[in-house]
């Protein structure tokens, strides 16, 4: 007999997801309308292309990047799409309620879709730490809590620290990483006997993960420049991100070879490290004045990423129960911090140059922002982890971790799980 969802989840998931979707439809009906202002079509298309780049990054890039498990590749890709679709809907509403609602209705523009896609991307980064250990009903909870936490964090940072869209969205890297790691810490950790093979990577899924990495690599400049205010800022951000990711690819491949006793290249190292430069320059991508600086940051990020991929998985596996190939959590936590530190260093250099106490105050504000992002990520992550442990969600048994057959119908398989 083929494997099935546990009976209760079969009843719980469709009911939970469809009720939620119906609630979202009602909220959209009562509280939103499209931006009806006249725009020229050419401008609209150009604006839409940025949003399209972000959607490609999310659906294909992050979807496939997490698909390297031998027996969990289908679930990785499809669950990512499910979370993206749900996350974007909730993020549009939440951002609207937090920023526009006093005026009566939430106006939906291409920019709000762009923002929402970036918010949903946060969930796709975080979920890498827990994919394979949770079912879709649990992922719905994770999407709702994380998008809500990130939206509120961004609003608080915007209001208290007076930062622009770009600066407060660039906390997404550390936020998503620490959120995911804290959720993983709450979930049952030990992989029981007999499941060791399931969290290993296989050739074809690893190839699709590499495809995901390539999509992310191609579109990372769009991500880092999407929320910047003027053409000069965007152009600079695109250039610097491109130089940084280009160098981090070279560093990743050569560093991976260097880290192996026989000089072999690790797929896992490469998957993660090719993106390192883009994450590291994220916060400061528009501020870096020359290519060589972006390239140096890409080099440093690539080395940190390879070093992290070599030494951290053992620790993450023991403490958090994160499999070796789930590299995004610790990778983004390190590189996101590096990016934030780079921005703070730029402010410190300003202080040294100007000898000005007020710029020193800006340094403190930036440290405060970063600390707040980490604290909210950890707290909301722990809350989510505790919620996901509730019996109501009928989480997969540990023996069925990292297994597509728990969730998918495979007609060609005669024998069940």
């Amino acid at each position: 007999m083929s494997s099935k969802y546990p009976r209760s989840v079969r009843r719980c998931l469709p009911l939970w997801a469809l009720t939620l979707e119906a609630a979202l439809i009602l909220l959209f009906y009562f509280f939103t309308h499209y931006d009806a202002s006249l725009e020229d079509q050419k401008g609209l298309v150009a604006s839409y292309q940025v949003g399209q780049d972000l959607t490609v990054m999310a659906a294909i890039g992050l979807g496939f990047l997490t698909s390297s498990f031998r027996r969990h590749s289908w679930s990785s890709v499809a669950f990512n799409l499910f979370m993206l679709a749900l996350g974007v809907q909730w993020a549009i509403l939440l951002d609207g309620f937090l920023s526009q609602f006093p005026s009566g209705k939430v106006v939906i523009t291409l920019f709000s879709i762009r923002l929402a896609t970036m918010s949903a991307l946060s969930v796709l980064i975080s979920v890498d730490a827990v994919l394979g250990k949770v079912n879709l009903a649990q992922l719905v909870v994770m999407v709702l809590v994380e998008v809500t936490a990130l939206g509120n964090l961004r609003m608080v940072i915007s209001n208290i620290f007076n930062t622009d869209y770009h600066m407060n969205m660039m906390h997404i890297y550390v936020f998503a990483a620490y959120f995911g790691l804290s959720v993983a810490w709450c979930l049952p950790k030990p992989l029981p006997e007999g499941t060791e093979d399931k969290d290993q990577t296989a050739t074809i899924p690893s190839l699709s993960a590499m495809l995901g990495a390539l999509f992310l690599w191609m579109f990372w400049p769009s991500f880092n420049s999407a929320l910047l205010r003027s053409p000069i800022e965007r152009k600079n951000a695109v250039f610097n991100t491109y130089y940084a990711v280009a160098v981090s690819v070279v560093t990743a491949i050569s560093g991976s070879s260097l880290a192996h006793p026989q000089g072999k290249i690790s797929k896992t190292y490469v998957h993660s490290a090719v993106l390192a430069g883009g994450v590291a320059v994220g916060t400061s991508c528009h501020l870096i004045p020359s290519p060589w600086l972006a390239m140096v940051l890409g080099l440093v990020a690539g080395l940190i990423s390879v070093g992290g991929a070599k030494y951290l998985p053992g620790c993450c596996n023991r403490v958090l129960g994160i499999p070796h190939s789930s590299i995004m959590g610790y990778n983004f936590s390190l590189l996101g911090l590096l990016g934030e530190i780079i921005y703070i260093v730029l402010l410190v250099l300003d202080t040294v140059g100007a000898g000005n106490g007020m710029i020193g105050f800006q340094v403190l504000l930036s440290i405060g922002e970063l600390s707040l992002a980490i604290v909210i990520a950890l707290m909301s992550g722990l809350l989510t982890g505790l919620l996901l442990n509730l019996k109501i969600w009928k989480a997969p048994h540990e023996a069925k971790y990292f297994d597509d057959q728990v969730f998918w119908k495979f007609p060609h398989l005669a024998v069940g799980f």
Epitope: Y165, L287, L346, Q362
Partner: antibody, heavy 129, light 108 residues
């Protein structure tokens, strides 16, 4: 020459609507953010709304949020302000202004600056019953 | 939301004198987003100083700006007859253009 020309002002009753236009010439309109600023009789300048160079993002002052809509048509080199549910306190001279962006650099970072470097002569909106 | 407070509200000076106008922000702001404008009766405002010490095109060197954090200053070293006008400071962060309430410089 480089200029901004506002039009569409006039006398209107409270609760009614009005649409202002700002025609730009002499520069690449699609490369600049644009703004509406108003000045009530005998009062100071008040920023009303702004729109990014590509039209993707719009900002409003709290006093007009939900009533006014800023938009632009880069193919026509024109910016608009649709004003609905007008109130007596919306009576003012409305200026359109171009957002100039630039930067200076040190060896390690860029410093961006933004200001309104080009203004129209203004169009008067009077809301009165 | 950032609030800009200009002082004094008005200033009575004679031509040739030095004018010092102050602008205080309710919280620390990036100095590169601060600008000063001059407005004469019946005319549109004109950009004077930005970022906070660069002069706009065509602005004479008797106008200078300084400051950082929360305190900014516009200085007119020697007032000329055409300088008597209302001066506004503006913060232009986050694409929102907050103005101060203005300082009127009038002939004594």
């Amino acid at each position: 020459q480089v200029q901004l020309v506002e039009s569409g002002g006039g006398v209107v009753q409270p609760g009614r609507s009005l649409r202002l236009s700002c025609a730009a010439s002499g520069f690449t309109f699609s490369s600049y953010g644009m703004h509406w600023v108003r000045q009530a009789p005998g009062k100071g300048l008040e920023w009303v709304a702004g729109i990014w160079y590509d039209g993707s993002n719009k900002y409003y002052a709290d006093s007009v949020k939900g009533r006014f809509t800023i938009s632009r048509d880069n193919s026509r080199n024109t910016m608009y302000l649709q004003m609905n549910s007008l109130r007596a306190e919306d009576t003012a001279v409305y200026y359109c202004a171009r957002e100039q962006g630039g930067y200076s650099s040190s060896w390690y970072r860029r410093y961006y600056y933004y200001n309104m470097d080009l203004w129209g002569q203004g169009t008067t909106v009077t809301v009165s019953s | 939301e950032i609030v800009l407070t200009q002082s004094p509200g008005s200033l009575s000076l004679s031509p040739g004198e030095r004018a010092t106008l102050s602008c205080r922000a309710s919280q620390s702001v990036s100095s590169s987003y601060l600008a000063w404008y001059q407005q004469k009766p019946g005319q549109a405002p004109r950009l004077l100083i930005y970022g906070p010490s660069s002069r706009a095109t065509g602005i004479p060197d008797r106008f200078s700006g300084s400051g950082s954090g929360t305190d900014f200053t516009l200085t007119i070293s020697r007032l000329e007859p055409e300088d008597f006008a209302v001066y506004y400071c503006q913060h232009f962060g986050n694409s929102r253009g907050t103005f101060g309430q203005g300082t009127k410089v009038e002939i004594r």
